[in-house]
C-alpha cells in the first residue's frame, strides 16, 4: 500500500463524507443537457459554452488555474457551490481525485450511452481548473476500473 | 527553462546506501511529481517510484519497497534518492524525470542527466 | 503487475517506415507514451499520448493503439533516427509507471 493512503485514508474519507458533491453533478449533468440541446444532441461537437476552457495546448496545465466563471444563470449557482465544496481537497490530491471519482460513480447510471459518458468524464475532468484548482495527477475516471490494487 | 541537475557518479561497496540528489530550476517546485528511473549497463528503463514535493506523499515500486526512500527539501528545490543494501544488480545510471499531464495521463518531459552508481567490492 | 512487451530489435532501410509494438493486456484503453534514446543520454519523449499538448516531434513520428497493442511508427527513415524505443503507461489499478523492455532501431 502507498504511504500516503495509509497516511491520508481516515482524513480524507471524513473530507468526503462531510462534502456535498451534488451540485458538482447538477452542474455537469446541467451543462452536458445544455451542450446537447445546443448542438442537436451530438455531444461530441466542439462546445461554445461559458464554462469551457480554452483550446490552448495547455489548457489542462493544472498549475496555471482559472477563476472559475460566474455566468450562465441555472448552472453558475451549481457551480459556484460546487467549487466551494472541492475547495476543501485543495490542498489532497489523492483526496480530490476521489471527490472526482465519487462525483463520476454517482452520475455513471444516469448517463445514457457510452458518448454522453465520455462527455461527462471531458466536463469532469475541467472541473478543478473551471474552479481554479489543480487537476489531479494520476487520477483514473473510469468507473469500470473497479479501484487500485495498492502495492 | 525546466533544468534538471543531479549529483556526480558514485562507487560503493555491497551492503552500503547511496544517495543521489536532484536539484531543479525553472518551474515552480512544489507544482509537479519528482519519479526516479535507473537503467542498468544494457538494459531497460526501470521506474522506482516518486514523490509529491508538495505534500511529501511517495510512491515506490514493489521492487524497491524498504530499501529506496525518496525526500525532497523545498528551501533548496531538490529531489533525493537514497537506495540501501546495494548489490552489484544496483550498478546503474540513475535518472529523476519530472511528471507531466494530469489524470490518467502520466509522463515524463524533463529528466536529469543521469547519475552512476557503481557498487564494486 | 502490468507488462509491456516490445520486439528486442527492429532494422529498416534510409528512407522506409519502421514499426515499433508494444504489447499488453487492453494497452489500448491506456495513455500510451513513447520515448527515444541515444547512447549515453537521457531519453527524450517522442510522443504523448496527450490530448492537450501537441507531440514535441516531427510529424515523421506517429502512434497509434488498439486492443492489446500499442505502435510507434517512424516514416522516412533517417540516420539519425538510430536510438533505443521505450513505450510507457502509467497503470491505475496498480498505481505504477510502467516502461516497455525497449526496442533498438537500427537504420540499415
Known amino acids: 500500500r502507498q504511504q500516503w493512503e495509509l497516511q491520508g485514508d481516515r482524513r480524507c474519507q471524513s473530507q468526503l463524507e462531510r462534502a456535498n458533491l451534488r451540485p458538482c453533478e447538477q452542474h455537469l449533468m446541467q451543462k452536458i443537457q445544455r451542450d446537447e440541446d445546443s448542438y442537436g444532441r451530438d455531444p461530441y461537437s466542439p462546445s461554445q459554452d461559458p464554462y469551457s476552457p480554452s483550446q490552448d495546448p495547455d489548457r489542462r496545465d493544472p498549475y496555471s488555474p482559472s477563476p472559475y466563471d460566474r455566468r450562465g444563470a441555472g448552472s453558475s449557482q451549481h457551480q459556484e457551490r460546487c467549487c466551494n465544496e472541492l475547495n476543501e481537497f485543495e490542498n489532497n490530491q489523492r483526496c480530490m481525485c476521489e471527490a472526482l471519482q465519487q462525483i463520476m460513480e454517482n452520475q455513471s447510471d444516469r448517463l445514457q450511452g457510452r458518448q454522453q459518458e465520455q462527455q461527462f468524464k471531458r466536463e469532469l475532468r475541467n472541473l478543478p481548473q473551471q474552479c481554479g484548482l489543480r487537476a489531479p495527477q494520476r487520477c483514473d475516471l473510469e468507473v469500470e476500473s473497479g479501484g487500485r490494487d495498492r502495492y | 527553462q525546466v533544468q534538471l541537475v543531479q549529483s556526480g557518479p558514485e562507487v560503493k561497496k555491497p551492503g552500503a546506501s547511496v544517495k543521489v540528489s536532484c536539484q531543479t530550476s525553472?518551474?515552480?517546485?512544489?507544482?509537479?511529481?519528482m519519479n526516479w528511473v535507473r537503467q542498468a549497463p544494457g538494459q531497460g528503463l526501470e521506474w522506482m517510484g516518486l514523490?509529491?514535493?508538495?505534500?511529501?506523499?511517495?510512491g515506490y515500486a514493489l521492487k524497491f519497497q524498504g530499501r529506496v526512500t525518496m525526500t525532497s527539501d523545498t528551501s533548496k528545490s531538490t529531489v533525493y534518492l537514497e537506495l540501501s543494501g546495494l548489490t552489484s544488480e544496483d550498478t546503474a545510471v540513475y535518472y529523476c524525470?519530472?511528471?507531466?499531464?494530469?489524470?490518467?495521463?502520466?509522463?515524463?518531459?524533463?529528466w536529469g542527466q543521469g547519475s552512476l552508481v557503481t557498487v564494486s567490492s | 503487475s502490468y507488462v509491456l512487451t516490445q520486439p528486442p530489435s527492429v532494422s529498416v532501410a534510409p528512407g522506409k517506415t519502421a514499426t515499433i509494438t508494444c504489447g499488453a493486456n487492453?494497452?489500448?484503453?491506456?495513455?500510451v507514451h513513447w520515448y527515444s534514446q541515444r547512447p549515453g543520454q537521457a531519453p527524450v519523449v517522442v510522443v504523448s499520448d496527450d490530448d492537450d499538448r501537441s507531440s514535441v516531434n516531427p510529424e515523421r513520428f506517429s502512434a497509434s493503439k488498439s486492443g492489446d497493442t500499442a505502435a510507434l511508427t517512424i516514416t522516412r527513415v533517417e540516420a539519425g533516427d538510430e536510438a533505443d524505443y521505450y513505450c510507457q503507461v502509467w497503470d491505475s489499478r496498480t498505481d505504477q509507471v510502467v516502461f516497455g523492455g525497449g526496442t533498438k532501431v537500427t537504420v540499415l
Open positions: 524525470a519530472r511528471s507531466q499531464g494530469t489524470f490518467e495521463v502520466y509522463y515524463f518531459v524533463s
Open positions: 514523490i509529491n514535493p508538495h505534500s511529501g506523499d511517495t
Open positions: 525553472g518551474y515552480t517546485f512544489t507544482d509537479y511529481e
Open positions: 487492453g494497452i489500448g484503453r491506456k495513455r
